[in-house]
């Protein structure tokens, strides 16, 4: 059977009026996985994002991360898009530097 | 194949409202994002907003704030767009589009004419 | 409110010849938002180019597009009789999202 990920944004300061926003997908098997950010829907090109490589995570599931860096004040126009076993959904920048959890069910 | 299907040509009077649908197939409903763009006669394109149907967020153009609403209805897969307090410069095609994975509107709904007469 | 200039506001041509279409923007657009359409009589738009120089789905080789910045060109290297069209630019790069008031190609 399938585990659907678990997915958590998380933004960080990166230079003076721009942030850094990652999103991580963790727990999640069979390792096929689509993790990529969205500006007003529309995904981002690859040379905008940088993504992590989808590895295991001990437990006979995998982890992997997509980040991109966007000016403040833009967020709410950011969404991280997750794909995976049919399954999809989006998950938006946290404000402040809270976390946003979302476990994709089935 | 992938269409978005609108509700058919209105007829309103100024101070009325109305509401216009779009039903997308040939895809999952909630994993792009709707646009709404209008068009008024003989003129070029105007954005009105966006709403992302998976977790709801709406962003609108500043000019639509106040008379424009979108909403979805996931259980028919059906997205909508009502306009208020219309006059007779909102005589329009108002359109429905698709977010892509690589431009803001690859597929397009038909058009729907709204006419504002008294 | 990035303002998308497109010129000429018409150009007469005949089938077999060359069409070379401009979009000005206001402001900067990196080329990953600059996207162009295609729109025939009582047609809906249809997404023709996409970042600037990528041929949508279905899209014939003929059309180009190129440029960066703030100045953008789509380019018909051989104009065919379904080519006959209303073109706009649009940028997804800032709100709100904007096109250009179009550029109608008609036969001379």
């Known amino acids: 059977g399938s585990v659907p990920p678990m997915v958590n944004v998380t933004r960080s300061e990166a230079s003076e009026g721009n942030i850094t926003v990652t999103c991580r997908a963790s727990s999640f098997y069979p390792r096929n996985i689509t993790l990529t950010w969205r500006q007003d829907g529309v995904s981002l090109s690859h040379d905008t994002q940088q993504w992590g490589d989808v590895l295991p995570d001990g437990n006979g599931t995998y982890q992997t991360w997509v980040a991109t860096r966007i000016c403040q004040g833009e967020e709410q126009r950011f969404t991280c898009y997750m794909e995976h076993s049919g399954n999809h959904s989006t998950h938006p920048v946290p404000s402040g530097n809270s976390h946003h959890h979302h476990h994709h069910h089935h | 194949e992938i269409q978005l299907v609108q509700s058919g040509a209105e007829v309103k009077k100024p101070g009325a409202s109305v509401k216009v649908s779009c039903k997308p197939s040939g895809y999952a409903f909630t994993s792009n994002n709707i646009y709404w763009v209008r068009q008024a006669p003989g003129q070029g394109l105007e954005w009105i907003g966006y709403?992302?149907?998976?977790?709801?967020?709406?962003i609108y153009n500043q000019q639509f704030k106040d008379r424009a609403t979108l909403t979805v209805d996931k259980s028919t897969s059906t997205a909508y767009l009502e306009l208020s307090s219309l006059r007779s410069e909102d005589t329009a095609v108002y359109y429905c589009s698709r977010s892509g994975e690589r431009s803001n509107f690859d597929y397009w709904g038909q058009g729907t004419l709204v006419t504002v007469s008294s | 409110e990035i303002v998308l200039t497109q010129s000429p506001a018409t150009l007469s041509l005949s089938p077999g010849e060359r069409a070379t279409l401009s979009c000005s923007a206001s402001s900067s657009i990196s080329s990953n938002y600059l996207h162009w359409y295609q729109q025939k009589p009582g047609q809906a738009p249809r997404l023709l180019i996409y970042r600037t120089s990528n041929l949508a789905s279905g899209i014939p080789a003929r059309f180009s597009g190129s440029g960066s910045g703030t100045d953008f060109t789509l380019t018909i290297s051989s104009l065919e009789p379904e080519d006959f069209a209303v073109y706009y630019c649009q940028q997804g790069g800032s709100l709100p999202l904007t096109f250009g008031q179009g550029t109608k190609v008609e036969i001379k």
């Open positions: 709403i992302d149907p998976y977790i709801g967020r709406i």
